[in-house]
C-alpha cells in the first residue's frame, strides 16, 4: 500500500520557523500535493499550499515557501508570527494524488519533546479518502 510520510521540524536558528516535509512512497505519477494544517484537507483542515508538478505552486499565509524536493517529496517553510508558537501543537497533513490510483493522506506534528532542529518523523497516520 502506498504510504505518505510527514515530518515537521523547528528550525534551530529561528524558533519561529518551521518546515513540513512530506513524501509519497507508491506507484504512479503524482498529480497534485495539498498541504493543510489543523486536520486533513476537506475535513476541518485549512489549506497551506498546493503543488502541481508542472503548473507550479500556490501557498497561503503563514506558508512562506513551498517547493519540490524530489519527484515524490515536497517541503513547506512556515513563518510563525505569533509569540505563543502555535505550530508546536498543530497537526499538518499532506495529501498526494497519483495517477491513476487516487489520493493518500497522512498527518504529523512536531514531536512533543522537540529540540530545535530535531526532525524525527512521526508515525504516519494514513487516511483513506473514501471507502
Amino acid at each position: 500500500t502506498p504510504e505518505v510520510w510527514v515530518q515537521v521540524q523547528m528550525e534551530a536558528t529561528e524558533l519561529s520557523s518551521f518546515t513540513v516535509h512530506c513524501g509519497f512512497l507508491g506507484p504512479g505519477s503524482i498529480s497534485l500535493v495539498t498541504v493543510s494544517w489543523g486536520g486533513p484537507d476537506g475535513a476541518g483542515g485549512t489549506k497551506l499550499a498546493v503543488l502541481h508538478p508542472e503548473l507550479g505552486t500556490r501557498q497561503w499565509a503563514p506558508a512562506r515557501q513551498a517547493r519540490w524536493e524530489t519527484q515524490s517529496s515536497i517541503s513547506l517553510a512556515l513563518e510563525d508570527s505569533g509569540a505563543s508558537s502555535p505550530f508546536a501543537n498543530t497537526t499538518f497533513c499532506c495529501k498526494f494524488a497519483s495517477f491513476p490510483e487516487g489520493s493518500w493522506e497522512s498527518c504529523g506534528s512536531l514531536p512533543p519533546s522537540s529540540d530545535p532542529g530535531l526532525s524525527a518523523p512521526p508515525t504516519p497516520v494514513p487516511i483513506l479518502r473514501a471507502d
Epitope: 506507484p27 476537506g42 495517477f99 490510483e101 487516487g102 489520493s103 479518502r129 473514501a130
Partner: antibody, heavy 116, light 106 residues
C-alpha cells in the same frame, strides 16, 4: 456506496457532436481521476483519457486528442466527455470509471449509436 | 505504443480444472492489471499490479509475470468464472488493453 451514474443511450448523426455525463456520489469527487473507456460492440476495451476534477488536469490518448474533450463540474460532482465529428466508428459503449485506493468503480455505460 | 497480445482468444474449462491465460507485451512493462467482464455488464478490475487481487476476488485467482510476459491463473475453475478477461498496462500512454480471453465453462 460509491456510484457512477452515466447518461442514457444517445443517437447521433455522422459529423455531429455529443456530450455524455458521469455523475459521482458517495466519495470525494475531486480527489480521484475519472477514466473514460470505449468498447465497441463485441470488441475489447480502449482507454480514451482521464480527468482529475480538483484542478481539471486531463490526459488523453493521441487518437482522441482534439476530438474528445473531458471536463468536470465540482459543484455537481459530474464528469463530462464531449466527442466531436462523429463517425460510425464511434458507435460504442462508453464507460467512466474511477480507482479509489485500489478499488475500481464503473458507471453502467452510455451507449452511443452514430447513424444517418 | 505498447501492444498487449492475449492468448488464447477463447478457451473452455471444466469445473475444477486449472486455467491459465497469458498476456504478452510488445515492450517491457512494470505491471499488468487484469479485468473481468461478463456479458452486458461493466468490467471490473480483478488483479492489479500483476499479483494483487482486488478486494472480493476469490483466492483461486492469481497473477504472475514480469517484463513482457504475464499470466492469470485460476487454480480450480468454477462456473461463475466464465467471463472475458482483459489485461492492461498503465506504463505508457496510450494505456492499452489486450484483446481479451473469453473463458467458457464446459
Amino acid at each position: 456506496q460509491v456510484q457512477l451514474q452515466q447518461s442514457g443511450t444517445i443517437l447521433a448523426r455522422p459529423g455531429a457532436s455529443v456530450k455524455m455525463s458521469c455523475r459521482a456520489s458517495d466519495y470525494t469527487f475531486t480527489d480521484y481521476w475519472i477514466q473514460w473507456i470505449k468498447q465497441r460492440p463485441g470488441q475489447g476495451l480502449e482507454w480514451i483519457g482521464a480527468i482529475f476534477p480538483e484542478n481539471g488536469d486531463t490526459r488523453y490518448t493521441q487518437k482522441f486528442k482534439g476530438r474528445a474533450t473531458l471536463t468536470a463540474d465540482k459543484s455537481s460532482s459530474t464528469a463530462y466527455m464531449q466527442v466531436n465529428s462523429l463517425t460510425s466508428e464511434d458507435s460504442a459503449v462508453y464507460y467512466c470509471a474511477t480507482f479509489i485506493n485500489y478499488v475500481d468503480y464503473w458507471g453502467q455505460g452510455t451507449t452511443l449509436t452514430v447513424s444517418s | 505504443q505498447i501492444v498487449l497480445i492475449q492468448s488464447p482468444a477463447i478457451m473452455s474449462a471444466s469445473p475444477g480444472e486449472k486455467v491459465t491465460m497469458t498476456c504478452s507485451a510488445s515492450s517491457s512493462v512494470n505491471n499488468i492489471h487484469w479485468y473481468q467482464q461478463k456479458s452486458g455488464t461493466s468490467p471490473k478490475r480483478w488483479i492489479y499490479d500483476t499479483t494483487k487481487l482486488t478486494s472480493g476476488v476469490p483466492a483461486r485467482f492469481s497473477g504472475s509475470g514480469s517484463g513482457t510476459s504475464y499470466s492469470l491463473t485460476i487454480s480450480s475453475m468454477e462456473a461463475e468464472d466464465a467471463a472475458t478477461y482483459y489485461c492492461q498496462q498503465w506504463n505508457i500512454n496510450p494505456y492499452t488493453f489486450g484483446g481479451g480471453t473469453k473463458l467458457e465453462i464446459k
